[in-house]
Interface confidence: medium
């Protein structure tokens, strides 16, 4: 359903959105897979407390998603 709330991004997905342009821009020859691998290495080398901003944002989006999906389901119910 195109009207359904969009799927949730993970903390890692949010991190990738932030740093993918830099990796791609600085290394234009890298394949999509290599860019993903580099981002994965960066994320894995990041301490838990440094991942917090992304985890907090992902949790906020999850909260919003749950509210949106509840509203969407309620809207879809017949009277």
């Amino acid at each position: 359903d195109p009207n359904a709330p969009k799927r949730l991004p993970s903390a890692f997905f949010l991190f990738c959105s932030e740093y993918r342009p830099k990796i791609k821009g600085e290394h234009p020859g890298l394949s999509i897979g290599d860019v993903a691998k580099k981002l994965g290495e960066m994320w894995n080398n990041t301490a838990a407390d440094d991942k917090q901003p992304y985890e907090k944002k992902a949790a906020k989006l999850k909260e919003k998603y749950e509210k949106d999906i509840a509203a969407y389901r309620a809207k879809g119910k017949p009277d």
Epitope: F15, P21, M42, D50
Partner: antibody
Framework: EVQLLESGGGLVQPGGSLRLSCAAS????????MTWVRQAPGKGLEWVSS????????KYADSVKGRFTISRDNSKNTLYLQMNSLRAEDTAVYYC??????????WGKGTTVTVSS | DIQMTQSPGTLSLSPGEGATLSCRAS???????LAWYQQKPGQAPRLLIY???KRATGTPARFSGSGSGTDFTLSISSLEPEDFAVYYC???????????FGQGTKVEVK
């Protein structure tokens, strides 16, 4: 040439506000984390705040948390530091810096902030 | 939070002598996130060494960095007149970065 140029420093009374700007040129500003570092007269370097490439994520030193706000305008290639409730201990040279290749390898010349009555 | 402690506070040496500057982290840190900077009066800091031992562009070969875990060292094999300055070690936390500087070591002319 990669360059950072700070402006907006000056003399301000305790409790006052000031907004620092840092104009970036010579690189794709929107790809990079940006950082403010300060140095009080005769003292060492102190990290103040950093912001992610999109501006969506920020970090602050405990000494400025709740008083300073870092932001950026990627369309203008400009970094900002809004400083409120200024104290005498905020008197320093404020440097704008970024990791162009590795670590903080590009620095501006700094702008001086003096908090005094 | 990780603290970086540098020693000595001041090093008095003559040109031509070697210098050893120490930096100790309050807990083990990855050498990937350890750097050294040089600062001269009235100037912005300049990156010398990153990843504990890699020389930044323009850093002369007489500068070398070493160490791992909690103990790191910046060595200058033979001091040139332009090397008399303040040196800072620094640790980086990631995304967006948070930087912790040591208090600095001043290398002065004896």
């Amino acid at each position: 040439e990669v360059q950072l140029l700070e402006s907006g420093g000056g003399l301000v009374q305790p409790g006052g506000s000031l907004r620092l700007s840092c104009a970036a040129s010579g690189f794709t500003f929107s790809w990079y984390d940006m950082t403010w570092v300060r140095q009080a007269p005769g003292k060492g370097l102190e990290w103040v705040s950093s912001i992610s490439p999109s501006g969506g994520y920020t970090k602050y030193a405990d000494s400025v948390k709740g008083r300073f706000t870092i932001s950026r305008d990627n369309s203008k290639n400009t970094l900002y530091l809004q400083m409120n409730s200024l104290r005498a201990e905020d008197t320093a040279v404020y440097y704008c810096t970024t990791e162009f290749y590795d670590y903080l390898d590009v620095w501006g010349k700094g702008t001086t902030v003096t908090v005094s009555s | 939070d990780i603290q970086m402690t540098q020693s000595p506070g001041t090093l008095s040496l003559s040109p031509g002598e070697g210098a050893t500057l120490s930096c100790r982290a309050s807990q083990s840190v990855s050498s990937t996130y350890l750097a050294w900077y040089q600062q001269k009066p009235g100037q912005a800091p300049r990156l010398l060494i990153y990843e504990a031992s890699k020389r930044a562009t323009g850093t002369p070969a007489r500068f070398s960095g070493s160490g791992s875990g909690t103990d790191f060292t910046l060595s200058i094999s033979s001091l040139e007149p332009e090397d008399f300055a303040v040196y800072y070690c620094q640790h980086r936390h990631n995304w967006p970065p948070q930087w912790t500087f040591g208090q600095g070591t001043k290398v002065e002319v004896k």
